[in-house]
């Protein structure tokens, strides 16, 4: 997901650190002045830049949505890292929302992988070991298990 923006309304506060651009670019944690003469530091906890750049404004820090936890807070050189809450995960094809992990596998299948913030539980057929990734059919009896514990950040 890209939840970042250059904010043309915000101007650098006078107390912000300034330096000269190198080859027309400013280092991570800074943006460039409109006359290209100065590099102005981003505001800690408010905005950031991750690369050498000539942004007129630093990028706004992401605010984690409800249903997400903040794994790393925003610094001047790194955006906030948000992660789905325990028992939910973020799918690649719908990264904007945290989906509930399945609570168990369909009959005849066993769980081989716990729920993590970036993947649902994984079930395989007892005999063949073939993966099953679909939703649990409503008529199937499920074996309930507790969701996995978040292990590392997913951005």
């Amino acid at each position: 997901i890209t939840r970042q923006s250059l904010d043309p309304q915000r101007r650098a506060a006078p107390q912000q650190k300034r330096s000269s651009p190198t080859e027309g670019l400013c280092p991570p944690g800074h943006h460039i002045s409109e006359d290209s003469r100065e590099c102005i530091s981003c505001k800690y906890g408010q905005d950031y830049s991750t690369h050498w750049n000539d942004f007129l404004f630093c990028l706004r820090c992401t605010k984690c949505d409800s249903g997400e936890v903040e794994v790393n807070s925003c610094t001047t050189t790194r955006n906030t890292v948000c992660q789905c809450e325990e028992g939910t995960f973020r799918e690649e094809d719908s990264p904007e929302i945290c989906r509930k992990c399945r609570t168990g596998c369909p009959r005849g299948m066993v769980k081989v992988k716990d729920c993590t913030p970036w993947s649902d539980i994984e079930c395989v057929h007892k005999e063949s070991g073939t993966k099953h990734t679909g939703e649990v059919p409503a008529v199937e009896k499920t074996v309930t298990t507790s969701p996995g514990t978040p292990a590392s950040p997913c951005s």
Partner: nanobody, 126 residues
Framework: EVQLLESGGGLVQPGGSLRLSCAAS????????VGWFRQAPGKGREFVSA????????YYADSVKGRFTISRDNSKNTVYLQMNSLRPEDTAVYYC???????????????????WGQGTLVTVSS
């Protein structure tokens, strides 16, 4: 919010020309340099060209040097890519990009960008 709108793509014969335009609808590109990238079918996005809107300094990928020309009209908040002597290998979706990002200050080729247009398709075929 920065929004980039490209236009000018189309079908052209080898050796032909096209001019792409990129307008910033939010009244700002949000950065001094604005560039063009392209993505050929089944390939990754590659840098094509960039321009410094303040002083007009230009940057080109080796594959387009001498054939493509980037320019800007600051009064219209628009950047252009004039593409001449087009080849079949130039066939791609062309993206306008702003907020270019570089790994080192001396780099001429950006590794990415913050803002992207929707892209305009350029097809070079006889």
């Amino acid at each position: 919010e920065v929004q980039l709108l490209e236009s000018g793509g189309g079908l052209v014969q080898p050796g032909g020309s096209l001019r792409l335009s990129c307008a910033a609808s939010g009244r700002t590109f949000g950065s001094i340099r604005v560039g063009w990238f392209r993505q050929a079918p089944g390939k990754g996005r590659e840098f094509v060209s960039a321009i410094n809107r303040n002083d007009g300094t230009t940057y080109y990928a080796d594959s387009v040097k001498g054939r493509f020309t980037i320019s800007r009209d600051n009064s219209k908040n628009t950047v252009y890519l004039q593409m001449n002597s087009l080849r079949p290998e130039d066939t791609a979706v062309y993206y306008c990009a702003a907020g270019l990002q570089y790994n080192r200050s001396a780099d001429r080729v950006p590794v990415g960008a913050v803002y992207w247009g929707q892209g305009t398709l350029v097809t070079v075929s006889s």
